[in-house]
Amino acid sequence: ANSLLEETKQGNLERECIEELCNKEEAREVFENDPETDYFYPKYLVCLRSFQTGLFTAARQSTNAYPDLRSCVNAIPDQCSPLPCNEDGYMSCKDGKASFTCTCKPGWQGEKCEFDINECKDPSNINGGCSQICDNTPGSYHCSCKNGFVMLSNKKDCKDVDECSLKPSICGTAVCKNIPGDFECECPEGYRYNLKSKSCEDIDECSENMCAQLCVNYPGGYTCYCDGKKGFKLAQDQKSCEVVSVCLPLNLDTKYELLYLAEQFAGVVLYLKFRLPEISRFSAEFDFRTYDSEGVILYAESIDHSAWLLIALRGGKIEVQLKNEHTSKITTGGDVINNGLWNMVSVEELEHSISIKIAKEAVMDINKPGPLFKPENGLLETKVYFAGFPRKVESELIKPINPRLDGCIRSWNLMKQGASGIKEIIQEKQNKHCLVTVEKGSYYPGSGIAQFHIDYNNVSSAEGWHVNVTLNIRPSTGTGVMLALVSGNNTVPFAVSLVDSTSEKSQDILLSVENTVIYRIQALSLCSDQQSHLEFRVNRNNLELSTPLKIETISHEDLQRQLAVLDKAMKAKVATYLGGLPDVPFSATPVNAFYNGCMEVNINGVQLDLDEAISKHNDIRAHSCPSVWKKTKNS
């Protein structure tokens, strides 16, 4: 309908204003509205002026129109020529009454369709509905994806590319892990991925100063160690070191008036030489205290070694051995005196006998023909040794004896000379001072070890070897090695240790094979003035453990493998250590601190006597244990 109207209008315009000249009224009849007429007529006059000479009057007159006038006039009413719309953004241009209308393509706006709509910034369709990147384009937009993603068929959503499936060898020997938009080459903990070699490399954490004292790096990890022998233990952060603290304080008060007989593991505590008038006879008086059952109290000899007298303890009773040119005798008698009480002992050479008294009561009288020691040059020269004898004497004894004696003497009077001179020597030497109060047991001060040689192989048993251990302990610190079996290659195939528990004021007992804990008894209150009892039995097939609370046969997946390691070591030679470890690497065991406290050990039915040890640190007390420190009102 519109085009028909346009054609009619065009025909009227041709007839009225080109073939003939028209005035404004006649033009009004063609356009039938004022805006178009007002727009057309001034431009029509310009066309006429261009193609006709002289002034044009509005009076109607006939004329021959030039073809150029026709084209000039025909062009006047078309508002869409020349095109006013933005070519990129318009869909169509509509000629209006002295105006135009540009119809815009989708994505464009404005009177002339000159403004691109940024669909990515549409508040009613945020980001153009794209899941990742919205790219605006002239008149449109499209969605795109970040690296590592692909566009889905809906052209809006992105899907992660699984690089691990696409390229299985992308990480080499490491594990490929797909992550949104990317992938990661993962290594086990303690390893770092090397891009060049496409492999996992061990991180040397020790080079990064992770540990306070000692660090051992191993593939995939590291372990920190603290010097237990210097009294340190690993803190809970497993990196720093802290002092092994006392959990049960002991009364370590000593008195110089009390002479400690076990100052040396091997050797004499005190050596005295007397030069007295020849009429002198041997005499010794002293108070004596011990829990030890065997050992040398005193040994006296002549200057030429030809005569000697031994005062010792055997089976808890006084024993006297003597030898001179006339006789050779051994006598044991009296009551058992290794009761931890002070006993007054006197040994006196009489004219025809040697009298031994305990608490002033005669317990032995030994006949002797002639003097014990022969005077020479009008003098009686005598050498006196406390708690031991010269090494060469050992072979001359009538009955061998273990000379080591853990005991104390006080109020001594030798050769009726009193204690003059001796006290002064002792006063300056702390090691020679005896504890004021002691109890039965063995004391490990946390500074050394004792070594035993024990044969664990039982030929009659099908197991081949077995270790049955009973421990009675009263620890003073919560961390330390109580018992360890050490191989010749400096490994520790079995150890029983104490560690402070994570729960406050309690301890754990660890059983370990080499540096692996095979069992942990948790949270025992061992730091008390009561002794704790622990037993375990181990052979190549089983590990059984009993505490006062429970008896347990331990079994877990890894145990048989660990017992196989122990079995291999037991078939070779192992040394038994009490109270700590010898010089083995820090990484050999989970714990390397010395044990501090009282402990009695029974292995395979035999109560271990520290006096029988192959070696023992001097500070370990074989048969005496300090009492628990009692808080007094003044302290």
Partner: antibody, heavy 112, light 107 residues
């Protein structure tokens, strides 16, 4: 028809955390962008942030250290958490799908 | 952040009047400017997006114009239901921001 409903405490003490829930019906929060906008007592509107259909978030930098927008697709709900609030956070809080569908708003007063 | 300033803050008109509300941006925002109406106790409603693009369901008496930094919302022959707050909002750059609003009230 998409409908959004804000819910949560109307009174929050200073220094505490403001927590609001937007429950959506008529549409799934796994499509589109889901926004939080607030209007202060003086009629000022502030755009707070969005959580998208994929779970990615955008926060207005002025709130970044305090704001968290999360969602639970199984409940078709999304959430606003604003930490360490002060009296300045007193406003009407709106949730909206794009900016075309809005909840009716909930007034939250921060006061001791 | 882009600041949008609306003027006047309040406009008092009689129903039947035609009005123009202004929104000025602190920097050019191209045509990423949208208008919202908020009546008392209601939530905002999108009226016009991208300066002049009409939203379905919105009466044709609402129209928009402008570009760059200066924009206008025109209401041809105001009706009683048109009274309330009008906000402009830009989506040119994050964070999206709103103008302070113009209150259209009955004279």
């Amino acid at each position: 028809e998409v409908q959004l409903q804000e819910s949560g405490p109307s009174l929050v003490k200073p220094s505490q955390t403001l927590s609001l829930t937007c429950s959506v019906t008529g549409d799934s929060i796994t499509s589109g962008y889901w926004n939080w906008i607030r209007k202060f007592p003086g009629n000022k509107l502030e755009y707070m942030g969005y959580i998208s259909f994929s779970g990615s978030t955008y926060y207005n930098p002025s709130l970044k250290s305090r704001i968290s927008i999360t969602r639970d697709t199984s409940k078709n709900q999304y959430y606003l958490q604003l930490n360490s609030v002060t009296t300045e956070d007193t406003a009407t809080y709106y949730c909206a799908r794009e900016f075309a569908y809005w909840g009716q708003g909930t007034l939250v007063t921060v006061s001791a | 952040d882009i600041v949008l300033t609306q003027s006047p803050a309040t406009l008092s008109v009689t129903p039947g009047d035609s009005v123009s509300l202004s929104c000025r941006a602190s920097q050019s925002i191209s045509n990423n400017l949208h208008w919202y109406q908020q009546k008392s106790h209601e939530s905002p409603r999108l009226l016009i997006k991208f300066v002049s693009q009409s939203i379905s369901g919105i009466p044709s008496r609402f129209s928009g114009s402008g570009s760059g930094t200066d924009f206008t919302l025109s209401i041809n022959s105001v009706e009683t239901e048109d009274f309330g707050m009008y906000f402009c909002q830009q989506s040119n750059s994050w964070p999206w921001t709103f103008g302070g609003g113009t209150k259209l009230e009955i004279k």
